[in-house]
């Protein structure tokens, strides 16, 4: 884990992050609510909303296509963990070729994990952990051989499931709601501030 | 605070559809999140379903998932719920509730969270 010092406005030392955070004012549709301080450059969010972007070559379409309700919250989760300066209690130093650190066990509010999973319940997926077990022989990631394609609901059963498995515990479901200061929103307004600061403030004192 | 008219109600048999309306006036908020409530007689009331106006971001409690939709028409301030193989225990008085809060998932679903509300449009389902 990072020092104190380093828990709060800062970005991951992974693949397409800046160095520090910086306003960015041409942020792209569903990554602009980070614009007045991001992590994430202009093209990168730019590549966030696209099928099979050059960020990770990662199809989200691999069993049929995705609902266009469920892909937003693919986009959205690609513009957190690209743009937020929040989420330095949880970064975690790793030993991946692409990158140097991940986040582990960010406490996303309940909501956002209930919304994307009842968004995404008529989208279908062949994989539980969608980090590892691809075949990327084709440049972009497909169904390993022998898995199946079947609802979101089969291989994530619940909510909490959605959000703690599919990027190998990168999330995990907050007890805590929306608004209260202690759960990252991965969806929230702008024009109302970001609610994120905050509690990253509040774990990073928890954690000193 | 936002003024809300519900209108669409009547009765219809079971396995029948309806549409209600909530229509929005009186706010300078640019996006609203809006719920469906209902209350049959001598019962609690019943969170139905809600939208946030932003992301066009619907969620359905249980009982209704699958047979009801959420919609929007932003140019006439109004949200819509489209009522399919409607039961007789879907029998009550429907209320729309408005908040300039972000809400989502389980949240549209807390009367709590509303601070203003319709006059409730009645729903009778025959057998």
């Known amino acids: 884990a990072r020092p104190r010092t380093e828990l709060l406005n800062v970005c991951m030392d992974a693949k397409h992050h800046k160095e520090k955070p910086s306003p960015e004012d041409g942020l792209h549709k569903q990554c602009s609510p980070w614009k007045k301080n991001s992590c994430c450059f202009a093209n990168t969010s730019r590549e966030a909303h696209k099928d099979i972007s050059y960020l990770y070559r990662f199809n989200w379409n691999h069993c049929g296509s995705m609902t266009p309700a469920c892909k937003k919250h693919f986009i959205q989760d690609t513009c957190l963990y690209e743009c937020s300066p929040n989420l330095g209690p949880w970064i975690q130093e790793v030993n991946q070729s692409w990158r140097k650190e991940r986040i582990l066990h960010v406490p996303l509010c309940k909501e956002d994990c209930e919304q994307w999973w009842q968004d995404c319940r008529t989208s279908y997926t062949c994989k539980s952990n969608w980090h590892k077990g691809w075949n990327w022989t084709s440049g972009y990631n497909q169904c390993p051989e022998g898995a199946a394609c079947h609802p979101f609901h089969f291989y994530f059963p619940t909510s909490a499931a959605l959000c703690s498995e599919i990027w190998s515990h990168s999330y995990k479901v907050s007890n805590y709601s929306r608004g209260s200061g202690r759960c990252i929103q991965m969806w929230f307004d702008p024009a109302q501030g970001n609610p994120n600061e905050e509690v990253a403030r509040f774990y990073a004192r928890a954690m000193s | 605070q936002v003024q809300l008219v519900e209108s669409g109600g009547g009765s219809v048999q079971a396995g029948g559809s309806l549409r209600l309306s909530c229509a929005a006036s009186?706010?300078?908020?640019?996006?609203?999140?809006m719920g469906w409530f209902r209350q049959a007689p001598g019962k609690e009331r019943e969170a139905v379903g809600g939208?946030?106006?932003?992301?066009?971001?619907?969620y359905y409690a249980d009982s209704v998932r699958g047979r009801f939709t959420i919609s929007q028409d932003n140019a006439q301030n109004t949200v819509y719920l489209q009522m399919n193989s409607l039961k007789p225990e879907d029998t009550a008085t429907y209320y729309c509730?408005?908040?300039?809060?972000?809400?989502?998932?389980?949240?549209?679903?807390?009367?709590?969270?509303?601070?203003?509300w319709g006059q409730g449009t009645q729903v009778t389902v025959s057998s």
């Open positions: 509730a408005a908040t300039p809060q972000f809400l989502i998932g389980s949240g549209l679903l807390r009367p709590d969270k509303y601070d203003s």
């Open positions: 009186g706010y300078t908020y640019r996006r609203l999140s």
């Open positions: 939208i946030y106006t932003g992301e066009s971001m619907t």
